[in-house]
């Protein structure tokens, strides 16, 4: 595939990544799939600055990120190491709360209204953010 050197239309460039901010809501798995179909992934927050950048663009709205523990330990969707990486959980979170009455616990992470993170039921229809890295090979065939 060809290397992507600039962001697609309606995506925002920041520090050699491109971001797309939804204005509608989907369950986490549907949001994850949406990003994959765009040759991207749900946003992976690796630094203070990236957190602040995303926070600025989403505003005070619950928004999915690419972090989940559906298979046990917390994992970033792009393989970034969770244990040694940046974290911004609200105090007392994640708590895998079962008291919501929707079955199961809370396995998907989202930005809350103040930007800090919370785990929630993955079926909730929250907004989401897709991210793709510039300079990575795109899946589109090269133009002949």
């Amino acid at each position: 595939g060809s290397e992507r050197t600039c962001c697609p239309v309606n995506w925002v460039e920041h520090e050699r990544s491109c971001y797309w901010f939804s204005r509608s809501g989907k369950a986490w798995a549907d949001a994850d799939n949406y990003c994959r179909l765009e040759d991207a992934h749900l946003v992976v927050v690796t630094s203070w600055e990236e957190q602040k950048f995303v926070q600025h663009h989403i505003g005070p709205v619950n928004t999915w990120m690419g972090l989940h523990d559906q298979n046990g330990p917390w994992k970033w969707v792009d393989g970034t190491d969770y244990e040694t990486g940046f974290k911004n959980w609200r105090p007392e979170q994640p708590d895998d709360w079962y008291g919501h009455g929707l079955g199961g616990g809370e396995d998907c992470a989202h930005f809350t209204d103040d930007g800090r993170w919370n785990d929630d039921v993955c079926q909730r229809p929250y907004r989401w953010v897709c991210e793709t890295e510039l300079d990575k090979a795109s899946q589109e065939p090269p133009l002949l």
Epitope: W48, E49, Q51, K52, F53, Q55, H56, F86, K87, N88, W89, R90, P91, D114, G115, R116
Partner: antibody
């Protein structure tokens, strides 16, 4: 009411170490990020370091990286700053300050009165 | 590092005056800009956070505006207790950085 009280300052020779403490009261210490900010005599404010409410993230100014270590004991409601290999340019009043959130906000809504550190031979 | 530049470095004004202090960032910091008031021998005081939100207990004569790289602190109808040094501070990037300060003196 929120109170932050620094201690541990004093006169120390270059190359030596000092540990500052900040005793917090009047709020749930374990829910807030904490910072150290300093002001050298006749100079402006300089941010030094931050620690998240749970210690999960720590950041330092380049001028102190590798020499200073921030830590906290939530069971004692106390913030610490371990200062090693002190230099004359570290001479300042050191303030502990509360982050308005758990760490990322970096707006300092409450400050202590400060403790003076003088590095001199 | 993000450099913060305040202007003027000092200014003289009288009680009742309107004063504007400017702060410029070396790159966009969106709205992550805070203002502090510092008096000799006293702990610094947060006045405004996130560009324009007044901290609880701060008089309404203080206001903030701006976005991106250019920000202002406005003090309407100066009071005697307002004579102090004012600092802007960005919280967008690490290291967190302050402006060099603006000293507001009685004329």
């Amino acid at each position: 009411q929120v109170q932050l009280v620094e201690s541990g300052g004093g006169v120390v020779q270059p190359g030596r170490s000092l540990r500052l403490s900040c005793a917090a009261s009047g709020f749930t210490f374990s829910s807030y990020g904490m910072h150290w900010v300093r002001q050298a005599p006749g100079k402006g404010l300089e941010w030094v370091t931050v620690i998240w409410y749970d210690g999960s993230n720590k950041y330092y100014a380049d001028s102190v990286k590798g020499r200073f270590t921030i830590s906290r004991d939530n069971s004692k409601n106390t913030l610490y700053l371990q200062m090693n290999s002190l230099r004359a340019e570290d001479t300042a009043v050191y303030y502990c300050a509360r982050d308005s959130l758990s760490g990322i906000a970096a707006a300092f809504d409450y400050w202590g009165q400060g403790t003076l550190v003088t590095v001199s031979s | 590092d993000i450099q913060m530049t305040q202007s003027p470095s000092s200014l003289s004004a009288s009680v009742g005056d309107r004063v504007i202090i400017s702060c410029r960032a070396s790159q966009s910091i969106f709205s992550y800009l805070n203002w502090y008031q510092v008096k000799p021998g006293k702990a610094p005081k947060l006045l405004i956070y996130d560009t324009s939100t007044l901290q609880t207990g701060v008089p309404s004569r203080f206001s903030g505006s701006g976005s991106g790289t250019d920000f202002t602190l406005t003090i309407n109808s100066l009071q005697p207790e307002d004579f102090a040094t004012y600092y802007c501070q960005q919280s967008y990037g690490i290291p967190i950085t302050f402006g060099q300060g603006t000293r507001l003196e009685i004329q």
